[in-house]
């Protein structure tokens, strides 16, 4: 399902458009030079930080247009069979538990945003990542313990939710169920990863709204 060539290309952020433009400019100036990507990314990031809102506006417009394109294409996109399971997301299903880092971010995001009101979501995330990396293992432990507890609770809740929500499963053959169990778990792991990304996107969107208020 992941490699469907007909699937619309993912939407690009304003920063991604900026990096793309940087790359094109670099290619024009140095057509034969090989690019040191970490150095190139660093330079792009530094340049982006110093850019005014007006300069960034062009790339934000490109991102908005691309978002509209993506949403338009997704409306008409029909995923291959077996991929439709993603469409319905039960609001009553237990919510995926946050990771230790996610819990840490919830603690310190207000401080970072409050001390640097002009920072973009990406830069806030970067600062939080730096904070987490610099946090001693001993100070990370409580977050890891809490995340583990929440994960344990989630696993119990999801097991109960699945048992309650699939009464027709009992009718199907036990052998068949066992066979498909491993495959199902793999799919769910994939789905969980996607869910987490979606949750983070949702939070970023909320933050964007917060930023507008500030």
């Amino acid at each position: 399902g992941k490699g469907d060539p007909k699937k619309p290309r993912g939407k690009m952020s304003s920063y991604a458009f900026f990096v793309q433009t940087c790359r094109e400019e670099h290619k024009k100036k140095h057509p034969d030079a090989s690019v040191n990507f970490s150095e190139f990314s660093k330079k792009c990031s530094e340049r982006w930080k110093t850019m005014s809102a007006k300069e960034k506006g062009k790339f934000e417009d490109m991102a908005k247009a691309d978002k509209a394109r993506y949403e338009r294409e997704m409306k008409t996109y029909i995923p291959p069979k077996g991929e439709t399971k993603k469409k319905f997301k039960d609001p009553n299903a237990p919510k995926r538990p946050p990771s230790a880092f996610f819990l840490f971010c919830s603690e310190y995001r207000p401080k970072i945003k409050g001390e640097h009101p002009g920072l973009s979501i990406g830069d806030v995330a970067k600062k939080l990542g730096e904070m987490w990396n610099n946090t001693a293992a001993d100070d990370k432990q409580p977050y890891e313990k809490k995340a583990a507890k929440l994960k344990e609770k989630y696993e119990k809740d999801i097991a109960a939710y699945r048992a309650k929500g699939k009464p027709d499963a009992a009718k199907k053959g036990v052998v068949k169920a066992e066979k498909s169990k491993k495959k199902k778990e793999e799919e769910e792991d994939e789905e969980d990863e996607e869910d987490e990304e979606e949750e983070e996107d949702e939070e970023d969107e909320e933050e964007e709204e917060d930023d507008d208020d500030e």
């Epitope: 603690e107 310190y108 001390e115 904070m131 610099n134 946090t135 100070d139």
Partner: antibody
């Protein structure tokens, strides 16, 4: 100006209880991790307990685990330390301090003036 | 637990002269990020402690530049280039890599 003002200290019998408060002002209290540190008469400093900004995670020194409870009320800009089953060795000046996270590297940048707790019969 | 050992425990000083306090930890305080998780505090007589140095060598705001911190791993030093009368008190080192532990303190007094 950052200010931390402890209160609630006093004389208590062994096995008794006491609740210390630390009123914070001059900064956004809800952004900061906070700690309690104590100092027995004529002795050195000992870290007692820490609490994260939301109050959702608390950490204790082994010497007070199970007896002391740290908490906070961000709406009142106040930090608390509930001390139960007090022992003579808990006699000390109790300081609250703010934890500054310099990109994750912690240090105690502001301290209160302290409140004296005496456990004696 | 990480043990912190300071020396000397008492340091008589002469105003205008330099002074030096040593702090040793039972385990390395050097984090993978290259920073040492060690701070220095001063407690003046009858006062609460105040931060002098954080992360081994960074002077806290408002701290005079005669104070400097150095060292890495398990051996650290706090130096006062020219002691002044207001520098008297007890100096503590504190590690924040594993929980929090302070050294026993070094009492600095004028000769």
């Amino acid at each position: 100006e950052v200010q931390l003002l402890e209160s609630g200290g006093g004389l208590v019998q062994p096995g008794g209880s006491l609740r210390l408060s630390c009123a914070a002002s001059g900064f956004t209290f809800s952004w900061y991790k906070m700690v309690w540190v104590r100092q027995a008469p004529g002795k050195g400093l000992e870290w007692v307990s820490s609490i994260v900004p939301s109050g959702g995670i608390t950490i204790y020194a082994d010497s007070v685990k199970g007896r002391f409870t740290i908490s906070r009320d961000n709406s009142k800009n106040t930090l608390y330390l509930q001390m139960n089953s007090l022992r003579a060795e808990d006699t000390a000046v109790y300081y609250c301090a703010r934890v500054q996270q310099w990109l994750g590297r912690p240090y105690f940048d502001y301290w209160g003036q302290g409140t004296l707790v005496t456990v004696s019969s | 637990d990480i043990q912190m050992t300071q020396s000397p425990l008492s340091l008589p000083v002469t105003p205008g002269e330099p002074a030096s306090i040593s702090c040793r930890s039972s385990q390395s305080l050097l984090h993978g990020n290259g920073y040492n998780y060690l701070d220095w505090y001063l407690q003046r007589p009858g006062q609460s402690p105040q931060l002098l140095i954080y992360s081994g060598s960074n002077r806290a705001s408002g701290v005079p530049d005669r104070f400097s911190g150095s060292g890495s791993g398990t051996d650290f030093t706090l130096k006062i280039s020219r002691v002044e009368a207001e520098d008297v008190g007890v100096y503590y080192c504190m590690q924040s890599l594993q929980s929090r532990t302070f050294g026993q303190g070094t009492k600095v007094e004028i000769k």
